[in-house]
């Protein structure tokens, strides 16, 4: 039997307002509204919390019966829909211990896990997975790309008691591995031996000057020489112009700086590699994954352009149940959502074309009127006469 610690689908109208608490840490936090957005698969089922004010911080949270994930799998799952074509804004959730003062939740409030998509400018389109380990927020060392389209997507984080994890988007695995390998929770297993240093006589030169090579006698020639073909101009006046000096030219016999031939260095020892030792500061931690207490799920976000919808929150210990829940919610409505969006886009295109046609028609009508106005006044004549006179109908 799966343990479901938290589940929120917003299926009871305004009922969510009694379960979710707004932070009062700042007076100008943005407001969440219940909405299924401009397009959806099912108007009722797709209702979720939507950010409604541009350029705001948001801070809203819901509490649940506190639990620990020690010795069991933790699954965090929710859907996010950036229907506003987001430029910069968060779509992630934070899991807090139940000691959090929900009315004072803010960006620096200590959390256990932060997970979900984040988009900001061209440089950030990633899924954050951050664990608070011994008081420090530790970021994943991998780059997990998030979805940046306008549709609803399902994000799932699985953390297992064997210290492995998995990130899924739309019920497909996008990343997995071990917590110790993919985060810097622990000091490195090996470090450079602090007592080792490169021996004085360690020769890292692969090639050396050939000691038997010597510079040829005739090597040193000046780079520039007086032009032997230059002649003093006839009208050169030494008193007026000073002593005549021929212009200089590049010396064809100049050989440049002499460098001895290179030979293999008989004493070459290769590049010195700093020996490593076991790091005395390293000790494995089999309980990296574990937290004593989860009690609050929070949305602590910044959004430049609002419109993001959060829905179908689930915290459980059962991977299969989470996958099933995802398929029964996001899975069921995603196709219809796309259909509705495509239909809207098509209608918009049609409207745009109609508007363009109308505009063109108006322009043609206006041009006709203008031409009539600018033509000379014509006498009332029959068409045949008019044609003979050279009049042409506009």
């Amino acid at each position: 039997e799966p343990a479901v610690y938290f589940k929120e689908q917003f299926l009871d109208g305004d009922g969510w307002t009694s379960r979710w608490i707004e932070s009062k840490h700042k007076s100008d936090f943005g407001k969440f509204v219940l909405s299924s957005g401009k397009f959806y698969g099912d108007e009722e089922k797709d209702k979720g919390l939507q950010t409604s004010q541009d350029a705001r911080f948001y801070a809203l949270s819901a509490s649940f019966e506190p639990f620990s994930n020690k010795g069991q799998t933790l699954v965090v799952q929710f859907t996010v829909k950036h229907e506003q074509n987001i430029d910069c804004g968060g779509g992630y959730v934070k899991l807090f211990p139940n000691s959090l003062d929900q009315t004072d939740m803010h960006g620096d409030s200590e959390y256990n896990i932060m997970f979900g998509p984040d988009i900001c400018g061209p440089g950030t389109k990633k899924v954050h997975v951050i664990f608070n380990y011994k008081g420090k927020n530790v970021l994943i060392n991998k780059d997990i790309r998030c979805k940046d389209d306008e549709f609803t997507h399902l994000y799932t984080l699985i953390v297992r008691p064997d210290n492995t994890y998995e990130v899924k988007i739309d019920n497909s695995q996008v990343e997995s591995g071990s917590l110790e390998d993919d985060w810097d929770f622990l000091p490195p297993k090996k470090i450079k031996d602090p007592d080792a240093s490169k021996p004085e006589d360690w020769d890292e030169r692969a090639k050396i000057d050939d000691p038997t090579d010597s510079k040829p006698e005739d090597w040193d020639k000046p780079e520039h020489i007086p032009d032997p073909d230059a002649k003093k101009p006839e009208d050169w006046d030494e008193e007026m112009d000073g002593e005549w000096e021929p212009p200089v030219i590049q010396n064809p016999e100049y050989k440049g700086e002499w460098k001895p031939r290179q030979i293999d260095n008989p004493d070459y020892k290769g590049t010195w590699i700093h020996p490593e030792i076991d790091n005395p500061e390293y000790s494995p931690d089999p309980s990296i994954y574990a937290y004593d207490n989860f009690g609050v799920l929070g949305l602590d976000l910044w959004q430049v352009k609002s419109g993001t919808i959060f829905d179908n929150f689930l915290i459980t210990n059962d991977e299969a149940y989470a996958e099933e829940f995802g398929n029964e919610t996001w899975g069921v409505t995603k196709a219809a959502e796309k259909q509705m969006k495509d239909k809207q886009d098509e209608e918009q295109r049609t409207r745009r074309m109609m508007r363009t046609k109308m505009r063109m028609r108006r322009m043609r009508r206006t041009r006709r009127k203008m031409r009539r106005k600018m033509s000379p006044a014509r006498p009332r004549t029959s068409c045949r006469e008019a044609c003979l006179q050279g009049w042409t109908e506009a």
Epitope: C88, C120, T124, K126, D184
Partner: antibody, heavy 127, light 107 residues
Amino acid sequence: EVQLVQSGAEVKKPGSSVKVSCKASGGTFSSYAISWVRQAPGQGLEWMGGIIPIFGTANYAQKFQGRVTITADESTSTAYMELSSLRSEDTAVYYCASSPLRGSGWYWHYYYGMDVWGQGTTVTVSS
Amino acid sequence: SYELTQPPSVSVAPGKTARITCGGNNIRAKHVHWYQQKPGQSPVLVIYQDSKRPSGIPERFSGSNSGSTATLTISRVEAGDEADYYCQVWDSSTVVFGGGTKLTVLG
């Protein structure tokens, strides 16, 4: 990579204000957070505040609250730091520094340090 | 407010290893960044997030953070490493710098 070029040296009277500019080039201005750090002669570095141009909101060190205003103009990729009610202790080199914006929260760029610095602007406050 | 403590000066012979410490209350819970500043120049980021090196910074520079001290280690010290070094953290929406350490390369 972004480059930061600051305005020239200033000599100011006590009680007046100074506005230093920091123009970014070679990168997307909205992808960075800009911090202002000052260094009095022979002293260490002191953070004054910062701004994330894409957010438009600034964050100030307690010590300078009410006396410093940090702004950004995205159209010219320029950040500004204005310090008012100048006193002789404000004589320092003022640096702007950028941090890559790796997310949509105030805290993100502070995970990464300030990886590009301007050349510094010397402000002398003297009567 | 949060404070970071650095030794005012550290001296080291060329080729040897220099260690500069940065102490602060529960500093291991912070991400520590290190900057190098040579006379008359702007600071340069040499280590971020405790131990990561920005591109272009030699491998000789490394960092660690455990217990109540973060450490910047410079192995095989060169004359060009002589500079002031500052540690920095982010605490309660504020950037905090250490007082700086002057590294002198002997000889």
